[in-house]
């Protein structure tokens, strides 16, 4: 009795959905009452399917309402675990254990990343010095550095601070500011550069003709 996995590594975005699969041998018909399926992650029980039904009482609270075994797939010889609204804490090594006549288990790794895609921006001006303060802020994982550039591709020196997000413990809140003397319609770019997996997200900031008071604020979506 051997379980097979088509993938032993899944990479998914924060807030997205993932379905991890373990395949097991099945005859032309499946006897649900002889099938045992366990899905676990480290010390957390996610799925315990015994005697044709899931025992939700044993499910770890962090997976409540988010994890389910796709029952229709069992008849195709697939123990498919679906996790919705994926969190950073879901990352880790999952184990599927299947008992069906024989018994076997396999390990699958889930990696979760959060792109710095939703970039908020703000432009303000010092009425005395006429210096503009450009600000970009986004949340993501893992940490990112912010690179400021001008429309003529000059790299500019900004100041970046990284704090923990209020939304989720492991998420990073990255804020970067650039102080610069600029003229109306000049264009600047803030690029959130993240490693592992490598991904760049850029927002464009256009200096307005005339800044109202207080400073204008808009959110830029990639």
């Amino acid at each position: 009795f051997t379980i097979t996995v088509s993938k032993d590594l899944y990479v998914v975005e924060y807030g997205g959905n993932v379905t991890m699969e373990c395949k097991f041998p099945v005859e032309k018909q499946l006897n649900l009452f002889a099938l045992i399926v366990y899905w676990e992650m480290e010390d957390k029980k996610i799925i315990q399917f015994v005697n044709g039904k899931e025992d939700l009482k044993v499910q770890h609270s962090s997976y409540s309402q988010r994890a389910q075994l796709l029952k229709d797939q069992l008849f195709l010889g697939k123990a498919a675990l679906q996790i919705t609204d994926v969190r950073l804490q879901d990352a880790g090594v999952y184990c599927c254990l299947i008992g069906y006549g024989g018994a076997d288990y396999k390990r699958i790794t889930l990696k979760v990343h959060a792109p710095y895609r939703n970039i908020s921006q703000r432009i303000s001006v010092d009425p005395v010095t006429s210096e503009h303060e450009l600000m970009c802020q986004a949340e993501g994982y893992p940490e990112a550095e912010v690179i400021w550039t001008s429309s003529d591709h000059r790299v500019l020196s900004g100041k970046t601070t990284i704090t923990n997000s209020n939304r989720e413990e492991k998420l990073f809140n990255v804020t970067s500011t650039l102080n610069i003397n600029a003229t109306a319609n000049e264009i600047f770019y803030c690029t959130f550069q993240r490693s592992g997996p490598e991904e760049n997200n850029t927002a464009e900031l256009v200096i307005p003709e005339r800044l109202p008071v207080p400073a204008s604020e808009r959110t830029h979506f990639m």
């Epitope: 009452f33 045992i36 006549g101 024989g102």
Partner: antibody
Framework: EVQLVESGGDLVKPAGSLRLSCVAS????????MSWVRQAPEKGLQLVAW????????SYANAVKGRFTISRDNAKNTVYLQMNSLRAEDTAMYYC????????????WGQGTLVTVSS | SYVLTQLPSVSVTLRQTARITCGGD??????VYWYQQKLGQAPVLIIY???SRPSGIPERFSGANSGNTATLTISGALAEDEADYYC???????????FGGGTQLTVLG
């Protein structure tokens, strides 16, 4: 080499008890379901009891339900058949058989142990 | 419960083709297994999943399964093939195993 060796067969009086054992070697015992299949003299094969490799799911022939109990000790690579309230019609050669990995078939069989129920 | 029907005996001339049948309601929708049992010995699995042969089983043994009948074919039967042959399927997979009554094959000549 896969080997299954049964023992415990004997001559026993009606209403008596017996415990059959089957010691397995040559494979990862805890990964396979195991069964007891019997064959009465000059008769065909009949599945007596089945036990899953994991979590101890069991199944019995209607003729033995409530009288026979199948169990396994994965640490000892052994499967047992506890037979109570024996009847004359339980007289048979009892074979221990290995499940063929998630299938209903049996890919290896022991040589059998004879149980005779007679007064 | 599920019933598998086999003819009690079948004869074949040496090196001719023997066909042993196993009847069951919609048996084609289930997997069928075949065992050979020689006198005084334990059964041996010779066909699984309708038509697959375990390693070490000669190519002259083949299986088919459709509709209400599964068939074991021995192409060019030898004297050593003289034995009882049992088909096996299930009512419920795994836990509901059912055997046919067995067919005694006699090889003549």
């Amino acid at each position: 080499e896969v080997q299954l060796v049964e023992s415990g067969g004997d001559l026993v009086k009606p209403a008596g008890s017996l415990r059959l054992s089957c010691v397995a070697s040559g494979f990862t015992f805890s990964s396979y379901s195991m069964s007891w299949v019997r064959q009465a003299p000059e008769k065909g094969l009949q599945l007596v009891a089945w036990i899953d490799a994991y979590a101890g799911v069991t199944s019995y022939a209607n003729a033995v339900k409530g009288r026979f109990t199948i169990s396994r000790d994965n640490a000892k690579n052994t499967v047992y058949l506890q037979m109570n309230s024996l009847r004359a019609e339980d007289t048979a050669m009892y074979y221990c058989a290995r499940g063929q990995g998630g299938r209903s078939s049996f890919d290896y069989w022991g040589q059998g142990t004879l149980v005779t129920v007679s007064s | 419960s599920y019933v598998l029907t086999q003819l009690p005996s079948v004869s074949v001339t040496l090196r001719q083709t023997a066909r042993i049948t196993c009847g069951g309601d919609s048996i084609g929708s289930k997997n069928v297994y075949w065992y050979q049992q020689k006198l005084g010995q334990a059964p041996v699995l010779i066909i699984y999943d309708d038509s697959s042969r375990p390693s070490g089983i000669p190519e002259r043994f083949s299986g088919a399964n459709s509709g209400n009948t599964a068939t074991l074919t021995i192409s060019g039967a030898l004297a050593e093939d003289e034995a009882d042959y049992y088909c096996q399927s299930y009512d419920i997979p795994l836990t509901g195993t059912v055997f046919g009554g067995g067919t005694q094959l006699t090889v003549l000549g």
